[in-house]
Every structure is written in structure tokens, then in C-alpha cells.
Amino acid sequence: QDSRGCARWCPQDSSCVNATACRCNPGFSSFSEIITTPMETCDDINECATLSKVSCGKFSDCWNTEGSYDCVCSPGYEPVSGAKTFKNESENTCQDVDECSSGQHQCDSSTVCFNTVGSYSCRCRPGWKPRHGIPNNQKDTVCEDMTFSTWTPPPGVHSQTLSRFFDKVQDLGRDYKPGLANNTIQSILQALDELLEAPGDLETLPRLQQHCVASHLLDGLEDVLRGLSKNLSNGLLNFSYPAGTELSLEVQKQVDRSVTLRQNQAVMQLDWNQAQKSGDPGPSVVGLVSIPGMGKLLAEAPLVLEPEKQMLLHETHQGLLQDGSPILLSDVISAFLSNNDTQNLSSPVTFTFSHRSVIPRQKVLCVFWEHGQNGCGHWATTGCSTIGTRDTSTICRCTHLSSFAVLMAHYDVQEEDPVLTVIT
């Protein structure tokens, strides 16, 4: 003991009371209040334990410290007062932090930040979906553009060339960002142009499977181009590729006029007001793609006529000749709008095709590709009429949008009856 009558053997975290006794410091406790032997110890009191009288208040957490405690705002909350720590509920000024507007979030650029009470979540942008195996609405959610996700090889078709094409498309989709829409569109069309110029083992598939592949390519291309073109800036774009594929696109904000897209072998005219779906805030897009290479895959594709047209043709012609499928005279073109509801246009669209010469006494038909339930399809004429045809050009008018072409059907046109000609 020292000269001042204070015990020198007091355990850690205690102070002497007198020469023979010690007491634990505030925030520590021992078995008995007064310590009379150096064998006793002072243990930290956990003020944050459930039975404790400490109350930090809402949106806060109690942190035990050596000999004391601190109240701090819970993650996702911050003190209005600016004081990082406090001691009781009356000093609590914790309120929710909006991580989204304050930029304190770590959402991927493919997602949108949503503030929640005390936290935030990252949701896929509209038209995007979570990457394979990653849940939506998490802090680490990463998404991909759905524009590409459905454009995968058609089931049951085994082609190494087609597989390579779709791997390239999926790679483009994986790396896609809205600012790259222009490049991505061009890359997809280049890949398609290359595929159709060099179809490889696609040409060894049975004809029906080739038609299914063509149907799948046309359908997917239209969806992808529609999705991507909404991210383009206003104006007119024209791209052409070595094997003859061509794209014309016009993007506008608010317009009330007709639009004409011109290409090497096709011209399309329609009203702008068809392009926009009511309530859709995005830009209006009108697009036309010429795909001459698609003709290879659509060789010998069937033509299905509606009964009335069939009857009319049989009245004016001797009937379909036995040598089979109609001949594709023109490039296959695909027309699309930002509005995907194009099955019944309020005013018709007009196409002018340049094409190979028509063989005399054959019937020229304006047709569209009708996608069948089985994923394949056939040529059809419903909603399309042939306005006029010359040797190497044909004007078509249609009340819907799809993929179009001019066919030459093997009908034997009757010789004119001179008596009827005189009467006429």
C-alpha cells in the first residue's frame, strides 16, 4: 500500500477506495461491489445487452465499447445533427439516407437504383432482365438487354454456321450499352450479311428447316432493330453491306407527315403517325431492311392464298402450273416501326420494288412472310394488294407490316378473247 492509504494491488479497470479495498470503474463490474482481493476482476458491462436500460431509439444501433457504449445510426441512415455518436434516444436524429439520389449506391449501369427504408436495391432497367443466375432487386444485380435474349438459335436446327452467328449476336447483346446502339445495329447487320452470303451448312438443311431458320431470322431481326433503334438520336441513317443487305432508318420525336425510305431495290412510304404507340414517350422509328441473301433460305417456300384470291386467280388464269413453288423476283425486305402493333394500320403502307424481269404470262404477286405457329411460315397475300407491275418494278400496298417480297407465281395467263376485248 502507498503512503496515501490507497491499495496498490487494484485489478485492471478499477480504482482504490482505501488501503484495503478497490471499486470497478464506471462501465465495469465485479462479483461484489467492493474488491478486497487482487484475485477479483472487473469485467466490461455490455450496456447494449437486451436487459440493459440503454435505449438508443429507432433507426440506430448500440455499440458496446470498453467501459462504455455508443449509439450510432443504422446502415442506410444518417444523423441530421451531424454527430456520429450519441448516448440516448433524446439525442437520436437518425433518418433514412436516399442512397440513390445521393450517389452512395453501387448499382450497375444496367440497373435502376430504388431507395428503400434504410437501404436500396438495384432493379433491371425497363426492357432488361437479370443476367443468368443473378436475382433481380439486389445490390449486386446485373442485367442484360432483353432485346437480344430471345434471339437464339431455333430449336431442333443443327447448324454450325448458324450457331456461330448467334454466338456473335449474344456477344453483342452482352456488351450492349444504349450509347452503342448505332454500332450494335451495324454489327448485327454485318454478321447477318456474312451469314447469308456464306450460309455454309444451312444450305444442307431440309428446305422446311431452311424456311424455319429464315422465319426465325426475320422475326428476331425485326425485334432487335426495333429495340435498338429507340436509343438512336434523331435523323436518317442508311447502312449497306457487301452482300447487299441494306438498312434505312428514320428517327423523329414528334412528327405529323408521311415518310419515304429509299433503297437500291425498294422504296417504302407510310404515315408517321403509324409509328408511335399512344402513350409511348420514346422517339418514333421507321425502318426498312433489304435482305437479298434471305432469298437463298426462302427458295421453294410455299405460297398460301386466301380462298377468294385463289378463286379469282383461277377465273383469270388457267391455274397453278405443276412445276411447283413460286419464284422470288425481288429482295426480301422487312419493315418495322417503334410501335410493334402493326397488324392493322390505319392507313396503308406502299412499297415499290425493283426486281428481275417478269416472264410473260406469269402472275406477279405482292406477298408477306406469315410466321406460322410452328415457328416456320409461308408466303401469303392477305392485306396486301398489287397496285401495278411493269417488267422490272411492282408497286404493293399493304395494311400491315412484316417482311415482304414480290413473287412470280407459275400461273398460265389465258390468251385474250378478241370478242371480249372488243366488248370491253
Epitope: 454450325q160 448467334f166 449474344q170 452482352r174 456488351d175 454489327s187 452470303e197 456464306a198 455454309g200
Partner: antibody, heavy 125, light 107 residues
Framework: EVQLVESGGGLVQPGGSLRLSCAAS????????IHWVRQAPGKGLEWVAY????????YYADSVKGRFTISADTSKNTAYLQMNSLRAEDTAVYYC???????????FGWGLDYWGQGTLVTVSS | DIQMTQSPSSLSASVGDRVTITCRAS??????VAWYQQKPGKAPKLLIY???SLYSGVPSRFSGSRSGTDFTLTISSLQPEDFATYYC?????????FGQGTKVEIK
């Protein structure tokens, strides 16, 4: 800096197995597609296998189909080539390479832009 | 499978020479062809993609062209560092295939 480093090569007896690794840095395997290409001593390049990160699809040369398996572990940022039923004719330097898409205003296309240094596989009794 | 037939298999040239290597595809591959340079004991390096596009960082003396199924790599003025083996590769269809290589040696 983009880098690919192969490992796992060595001497193995005919019929044996090896697993080659291709560790990527400077980019993520989850957002790239990877090829394995081999080169027998004094010979030319032969494509072996490919894995697409986006579709998960895999393709193989006929000479290795059914014996080799390509895979990727995104958490380790590594691609693998599991080689079973090895033959003397599989002796080669094995390279992994990144399949990259180039897109600018005037040119578009694909190519193998980064390659590893290669790892030697010797199949011999 | 698509065969890529490269010619010549080797050639001797001097610094400053114009060198042309050709590659013929057994069927149409469109423009999906790349060219690589490989030096002994090293990995190949990409020179040209999409038949005629120069990869970044590659000197402009290298160029590629296409005529149907024939593809050409041209080195306009051969430099000492260009002595190597060159390979063409088609990327149109699986399996991806390489040409057998052309070795460019010093005359």
C-alpha cells in the same frame, strides 16, 4: 492490362488426364468468350474448343469431341480445358485466347485479340 | 468443315520487299477472316480482322483484302521484325479453322 496465363501442362501417359487453366486479368471471363488453340511441335495452329460466356454454349474440334471439356469459373475469372483419354497426337503447346468483337464507326468484326503464353502438354509413355 | 488453304507455305524476301500471302476458303466464308503473326516460341498476334480491318497498334504496312473466297495479306514494305509465320483463320462457322501457315524468311 489484359492478360491470359495458362497453367496445368506437363507430361502425361496415353489415356491419362490433365486440366489446363487459363487465368484472366484485366477483363472478366464472365463477359468474354474464350477459345483454346493448340500447336503441335513444328506444326501450325489448330483450333480446339470455344465457350461463349453469354450463351454458355461450347463447341469442339472433331479431333477432341467427347474427350475434352471447356468450362469457366467466373468467381476465379478462369477458363479450363479438361482433357481426358489423352493420345500422343494431343502433344502440343495449348494457348487460350479471348474472342473479341471490334466495332467502330467504320469497321466491325471478330478476332482473337489476346493470347496466353501457352502451356506444353506432352503425351508419352 | 471449311478448309483454309494458304500459299505459299514459305517464302524468302528482303527488307523493303512487298510480300503477298494468300488464303483460299473451301467454301464461302463472307468476310469473316482474320490474319495472325507468330514468332518462334511466342503466341500468335492478331493483325487483321474481318478480312481487311487493321487491328489497333498494327503498322499500316499490313493490309488485308478479299476477292470472293480468296483472301490476301500484304506487307507493303517488309521490315526486319516482320520475319515470322503468318496464319489466316475463318470465323464463319464452327469448327473454326486456320490455314497451315506461311513462313516468311530472310533472303
Amino acid at each position: 492490362e489484359v492478360q491470359l496465363v495458362e497453367s496445368g501442362g506437363g507430361l502425361v501417359q496415353p489415356g491419362g488426364s490433365l486440366r489446363l487453366s487459363c487465368a484472366a486479368s484485366g477483363f472478366t471471363v464472365s463477359s468474354s468468350s474464350i477459345h483454346w488453340v493448340r500447336q503441335a511441335p513444328g506444326k501450325g495452329l489448330e483450333w480446339v474448343a470455344y465457350i461463349s460466356s453469354s450463351s454458355g454454349s461450347t463447341y469442339y474440334a472433331d479431333s477432341v469431341k467427347g474427350r475434352f471439356t471447356i468450362s469457366a469459373d467466373t468467381s476465379k475469372n478462369t477458363a479450363y480445358l479438361q482433357m481426358n483419354s489423352l493420345r500422343a497426337e494431343d502433344t502440343a503447346v495449348y494457348y487460350c485466347a479471348r474472342d473479341f468483337y471490334f466495332g467502330s464507326y467504320y469497321s466491325f468484326g471478330w478476332g482473337l485479340d489476346y493470347w496466353g503464353q501457352g502451356t506444353l502438354v506432352t503425351v508419352s509413355s | 468443315d471449311i478448309q483454309m488453304t494458304q500459299s505459299p507455305s514459305s517464302l524468302s524476301a528482303s527488307v523493303g520487299d512487298r510480300v503477298t500471302i494468300t488464303c483460299r476458303a473451301s467454301q464461302s466464308v463472307s468476310s469473316a477472316v482474320a490474319w495472325y503473326q507468330q514468332k518462334p516460341g511466342k503466341a500468335p498476334k492478331l493483325l487483321i480482322y474481318s478480312a481487311s480491318s487493321l487491328y489497333s497498334g498494327v503498322p499500316s504496312r499490313f493490309s488485308g483484302s478479299r476477292s470472293g473466297t480468296d483472301f490476301t495479306l500484304t506487307i507493303s514494305s517488309l521490315q526486319p521484325e516482320d520475319f515470322a509465320t503468318y496464319y489466316c483463320q475463318q470465323d464463319s462457322s464452327y469448327p473454326i479453322t486456320f490455314g497451315q501457315g506461311t513462313k516468311v524468311e530472310i533472303k
